[in-house]
Interface confidence: low
């Protein structure tokens, strides 16, 4: 025997209190599939969360974060404070990157500069708190007697790490 609830479309629920007829989801709730016996409560984007997409009878609300914060976790389950480039977020707030480290984004941690010498290369552009170093060609890349002109480094523009 077919379950009468299977005929209830998305946006409704199968109401056992009313002889299993399909009732519209109540305010601020939704059902994204048919045949549901209850509707789910819509997510509320409050405080530091901001509504990215409103709830409807068939789909949940989606949140993002207010300016100065960014999403973390699946479906933006948390909002974390932004820092400036050249900083990282600690328990005591935004702190400048220590010497020898950088962060080119408003989120995440400071990472060590690339060690050019590990690849047998020299430092072409020094690193900063906001940018990684740019590694240049190794001394052996030049033949004796060849003028040591500076060569463009692929991917060496600001914001890119050259390994």
């Amino acid at each position: 025997l077919q379950d009468p609830c299977s005929n209830c479309p998305a946006g409704t629920f199968c109401d056992n209190n009313r002889n299993q007829i399909c009732s519209p989801c109540p305010p601020n709730s939704f059902s994204s599939a048919g045949g549901q016996r209850t509707c789910d409560i819509c997510r509320q984007c409050k405080g530091v969360f901001r509504t990215r997409k409103e709830c409807s009878s068939t789909s949940n609300a989606e949140c993002d974060c207010t300016p100065g914060f960014h999403c973390l976790g699946a479906g933006c389950s948390m909002c974390e404070q932004d820092c400036k480039q050249g900083q990282e977020l600690t328990k005591k707030g935004c702190k400048d990157c220590c010497f020898g480290t950088f962060n080119d984004q408003k989120r995440g941690i400071c990472r060590p500069w690339t060690n050019c010498s590990l690849d047998g290369k020299s430092v072409l552009v020094n690193g900063t708190k906001e940018r990684d170093v740019v590694c240049g060609p190794s001394p052996t890349d030049f033949s004796p007697g060849t003028p040591s002109t500076t060569m463009p480094v692929p991917g060496g523009e600001p914001g890119h790490t050259s390994h």
Epitope: P24, C25, P26, P27, N28, S29, F30, C42, Q44, C45, K46, T51, R52, K53, E54, C55, S56, S57, T58, S59, A61, E62
Partner: antibody, heavy 114, light 110 residues
Framework: QSLEESGGRLVTPGTPLTLTCTVS????????MSWVRQAPGKGLEWIGY?????SLYYASWAKGRFTISRTSTTVDLKMTSLTTEDTATYFC???????????WGPGTLVTVSS | DIVMTQTPASVSEPVGGTVTINCQAS??????LAWYQQKPGQRPKRLIY???DLASGVPSRFSASGSGTEYALTISDLESADAATYYC????????????FGGGTEVVVK
């Protein structure tokens, strides 16, 4: 982010009229949109909603005579069988189940007179 | 449809005074209530949503409370700029109950 209504004018009773709400700075796929009207010297009166999925909700008095539809950047209100009682400023407003109506257009005046 | 009954229709208070506007819903509206301010010839401006949450940029002189069927908006330390008409608004409609506005309260600041 802004809303702008257009299409309001003087019409005679029985004339159909379509109002348009043009949105900028946000996507209609992410917000419910409503039409609300206000007769001269009177209060606000809700006409209907279109939700993010395109589903429509109307005030009981508006069903049949008012139709809401949308494109990617506009929300239209089609009105038929207009009477002098429909003379009002018509507003479009953004918002749904979370915040109420957080953004309003300046309104467009519809005058129905013989 | 839900009916929102707003009282009083008009109130007059001096600068620095306090005004309270009440709104009664014909059935439980679960705090899906907003308050708006409207000045003549202007669009409404949202002040409160969720019965008590202050909208961004709204001074803390505006406060609201309520649950179930009874809600109230309070304006303290009245300023001349607060002279306007205020509306309550039930805004959840998925149930088919329909959206509804109160009839409005005119606030006159003396």
């Amino acid at each position: 982010q802004s809303l702008e209504e257009s299409g309001g004018r003087l019409v005679t009773p029985g004339t159909p009229l379509t109002l348009t709400c043009t949105v900028s700075g946000f996507s209609l796929n992410d917000y419910w949109m409503s039409w609300v009207r206000q007769a001269p010297g009177k209060g606000l009166e809700w006409i209907g909603y279109i939700d993010v999925g395109g589903s429509l909700y109307y005030a009981s008095w508006a069903k049949g005579r008012f139709t809401i539809s949308r494109t990617s950047t506009t929300v239209d209100l089609k009105m038929t069988s207009l009477t002098t009682e429909d003379t009002a400023t018509y507003f479009c407003a953004r918002g749904g189940l979370t915040y109420g109506f957080d953004l309003w257009g300046p309104g467009t005046l519809v005058t129905v007179s013989s | 449809d839900i009916v929102m009954t707003q009282t009083p229709a008009s109130v007059s208070e001096p600068v620095g005074g306090t005004v309270t506007i009440n709104c009664q819903a014909s059935e439980d509206i679960s705090s899906y209530l907003a308050w708006y301010q409207q000045k003549p010839g202007q669009r409404p401006k949202r002040l409160i949503y969720g019965a008590s949450d202050l909208a961004s940029g709204v001074p803390s002189r505006f406060s609201a409370s309520g649950s179930g069927t009874e809600y109230a908006l309070t304006i303290s330390d009245l300023e001349s700029a607060d002279a306007a008409t205020y509306y309550c608004h039930y805004y959840a409609t998925i149930s088919g109950l329909g959206v509804a506005f109160g009839g409005g309260t005119e606030v006159v600041v003396k």
